[in-house]
């Protein structure tokens, strides 16, 4: 599990909200833009992390749990 700083009243995820102290996002958008939740068909897109949707590009990206890396958070981060 990651370094979420989410308070206990929420249904916790393994990585916090963008802007909180999380592992760097992979598949970076070309420009700063708006993210929303990934559509349901991407429910299992991120193997060890949370999926978020790059609205301008209509593509999914992943915020990896601590200790994982890769476009879909599919690899163990050996440097962690």
């Amino acid at each position: 599990s990651g370094n979420s700083t989410r308070s206990p009243e929420t249904n916790g995820l393994s990585c916090g909200y963008p802007g909180e102290n999380c592992t760097a996002t992979t598949v970076q958008p070309k420009r700063k833009g708006h993210f929303s939740r990934c559509p349901k068909q991407y429910k299992h897109y991120c193997i060890k992390g949370r999926c978020r949707f790059v609205v301008a590009e209509q593509t999914p990206s992943c915020i990896c749990d601590e200790g994982y890396t890769g476009a879909r958070c599919e690899r163990v981060d050996l440097f962690y």
């Epitope: 700083t5 308070s7 009243e9 929420t10 249904n11 995820l13 916090g16 909200y17 963008p18 802007g19 909180e20 700063k32 708006h34 993210f35 929303s36 939740r37 990934c38 559509p39 349901k40 068909q41 949370r50 978020r52 949707f53 609205v55």
Partner: antibody, heavy 119, light 107 residues
Framework: QVQLLESGGGLVQPGGSLRLSCAAS????????MSWVRQAPGKGLEWVSG???????TYTDSVKGRFTISRDNSKNTLYLQMNSLRAEDTAVYYC?????????????WGQGTLVTVSS | SYELTQPLSVSVALGQTARITCSGD??????VHWYQQKPGQAPVLVIY???DRPSGIPERFSGSNSGNTATLTISRAQAGDEADYYC?????????FGGGTKLTVLG
């Protein structure tokens, strides 16, 4: 304790303006997307506007160009500036916290503030 | 624009099972959330992501979503369950609510 408290509602004439505020407490306000949802008397819920933690804004068609959503993270406060008000804007306005980001669900709601547009 | 359709009212006998439906085109491909609202109060989230329950919500509340219909099921209905219930989904960067269903608990 996680809490949202709206204020600023009242009676305003058609064409007038009003600014609603929503004071947040008990959580890291700047980390969440926030929304305004309204409910006309005896009617259902209608989403009005949303604001992401990085400043992205989105509105329902009927308020575009008239309403502006904003936030002041230093004051833990969400705002809704309402201009060119119409009778059909009469409703209880709720401030709601989006779980994580846009596209999730509203896990915390305020108690609402009533806006009445009438001459 | 995307539309969610709910029955205006549903009645259930005390202790029995109530089912409230929410219909929308291919709604099964979207996440659906349910809110309970009692008179004069703010809405409360009772089901999120089709079938998950927030902490503090009784196990009697459950949800399902498939095809063109999402369903909120309330087992062993109690008098305190009498309220308006709204389904909600996300479409094209905007929030969509159903029209709401008034649940009446008889007896």
């Amino acid at each position: 304790q996680v809490q949202l408290l709206e204020s600023g509602g009242g009676l305003v004439q058609p064409g007038g303006s009003l600014r609603l505020s929503c004071a947040a407490s008990g959580f890291t306000f700047s980390s969440y997307a926030m929304s305004w949802v309204r409910q006309a008397p005896g009617k259902g819920l209608e989403w009005v506007s949303g604001l992401g933690h990085v400043g992205y804004t989105t509105y329902t068609d009927s308020v575009k160009g008239r309403f502006t959503i904003s936030r002041d993270n230093s004051k833990n406060t969400l705002y809704l500036q309402m201009n060119s008000l119409r009778a059909e804007d009469t409703a209880v306005y709720y401030c709601a916290r989006d779980y994580l980001d846009f596209g999730y669900y509203f896990d915390v709601w305020g108690q609402g503030t009533l806006v009445t547009v009438s001459s | 624009s995307y539309e969610l359709t709910q029955p205006l009212s549903v009645s259930v006998a005390l202790g029995q099972t109530a089912r409230i439906t929410c219909s929308g085109d291919k709604i099964g491909k979207k996440y659906v959330h349910w809110y309970q609202q009692k008179p004069g109060q703010a809405p409360v989230l009772v089901i999120y992501d089709d079938s998950d329950r927030p902490s503090g919500i009784p196990e009697r509340f459950s949800g399902s979503n498939s095809g063109n219909t999402a369903t909120l099921t309330i087992s062993r209905a109690q008098a305190g369950d009498e309220a308006d219930y709204y389904c909600q989904a996300w479409d094209m960067q905007s929030v969509v609510f159903g029209g709401g269903t008034k649940l009446t608990v008889l007896g």
